[in-house]
């Protein structure tokens, strides 16, 4: 028989490699049987994770799994770092592992010099 | 410099579509966001949609069934269509350039906008 | 969606005199910009992201606010300064304008 537990299927050091700039939505599967839990995503700072408010987030349901869904529109540089979801169900809260998002700053990117520009201009 | 500026029809009848383009000039569509904007006397500023730099949209939900948004880097030209006009889409239409800093993202040049009738 | 509602729709004041319009948003949203217009031009980018005054904004304009409440301030008014001013939210698609208030000169 199958548990009826809530469970977040986020994998151990999943990571996200993504362009600031550009749409991004970072995706919390969420098992559940019969009454949706409230879903959170927040953010790691040192060994706090603070929630993230004023985010939009939306929920995607499919046949045999849900997501909540943390929109970024865009992603920006300060997006950078780890999330988590948490649900709270019941009396119950569980925790999602940690994923991390690693944003390239496609702005500052094509401004800077190149690695061979850099070193030409080294030994010229 | 940078430069938005958006060409229309001027006129457009009534259950037809509209094309509007968009040219840009001193920013490159595959870094930068294009958002169109529209401005009528009785809704006052309504964001439309905007192409992404990597080719995705997003739209507003409102008026999301009868908008497309598309682009040629190439030509650095975004193109936005609308179908089914009715008079209350009479507005000038803007394009705007979206950017990015490190916590926040605004529409920062705006292109000086096409006037846009719908009358039979 | 959220609504932002600006106060005073029509703002009248004197040169030298201090000026505050108010935007209030039917949600938290994280920060707040703030658009100029001038009759026949398009909107300018006037104040980003609650405070940060765009290029070439005089000194005497400030911004401020969190949560559901923002604030546009002009320390001292001047005849450049009577215009529509909008505030903006890119929180939420869709990202939303306030109906403006109109600054005018006495």
């Known amino acids: 028989k199958e548990s009826c537990d809530v469970q977040l299927y986020i994998k151990r050091q999943s990571e996200h490699s993504i362009l600031a700039g550009d749409p991004f939505e970072l995706e919390c599967p969420v098992k559940y049987c019969a009454n949706r839990p409230h879903v959170t995503w927040c953010k790691l700072n040192g060994t706090t994770c603070v929630k993230l408010e004023d985010r939009q987030t939306s929920w995607k349901e499919e046949k045999n799994i849900s997501f909540f869904i943390l929109h970024f529109e865009p992603v920006l540089p300060n997006d950078n770092g780890s999330y988590r979801c948490s649900a709270n169900f019941q009396s119950n809260r569980i925790e999602s592992h940690s994923t991390t998002l690693y944003v390239t700053d496609v702005k500052s990117a094509s401004e800077r010099p190149s690695k061979d520009e850099m070193a030409s201009r080294f030994w010229a | 410099q940078v430069q938005l500026k958006e060409s229309g029809p001027g006129l457009v009848a009534p259950s037809q579509s509209l094309s509007i383009t968009c040219t840009v000039s001193?920013?490159?569509?595959?870094?930068?966001?294009v958002h169109w904007v529209r401005q009528s006397p009785g809704k006052g500023l309504e964001w439309l949609g905007v192409?992404?730099?990597?080719?995705?949209?997003s739209y507003n939900p409102a008026p999301m069934s009868r908008l497309s948004i598309s682009k040629d880097n190439s030509k650095s030209q975004v193109f936005l269509k609308m179908n089914s006009l009715q008079t209350d889409d009479t507005a000038m239409y803007y394009c705007?350039?979206?950017?990015?800093?490190?916590?926040?993202?605004?529409?920062?040049?705006w292109g000086q906008g096409t006037s846009v009738t719908v009358s039979s | 969606q959220i609504v932002l509602s600006q106060s005073p729709a029509i703002l009248s004041a004197s040169p030298g005199e201090k000026v505050t319009m108010t935007c209030r948003a039917s949600s938290s949203v994280s920060y707040m910009h703030w658009y100029q217009q001038k009759p026949g031009s398009s909107p300018k980018p006037w104040i980003y992201?609650?405070?940060n005054l765009a290029s070439g904004v005089p000194a005497r304009f400030s911004g401020s606010g969190s949560g559901t409440s923002y604030s546009l301030t002009i320390s001292r008014m001047e005849a450049e300064d009577a215009a529509t001013y909008y505030c903006h939210q890119w929180s939420s698609n869709p990202y939303t304008f306030g109906g403006g208030t109109k600054l005018e000169i006495k």
């Open positions: 992201a609650t405070s």
């Open positions: 705007v350039r979206g950017d990015y800093e490190y916590d926040y993202y605004a529409m920062d040049y």
């Open positions: 192409m992404w730099p990597g080719g995705r949209t």
């Open positions: 001193g920013f490159s569509l595959t870094t930068y966001g």
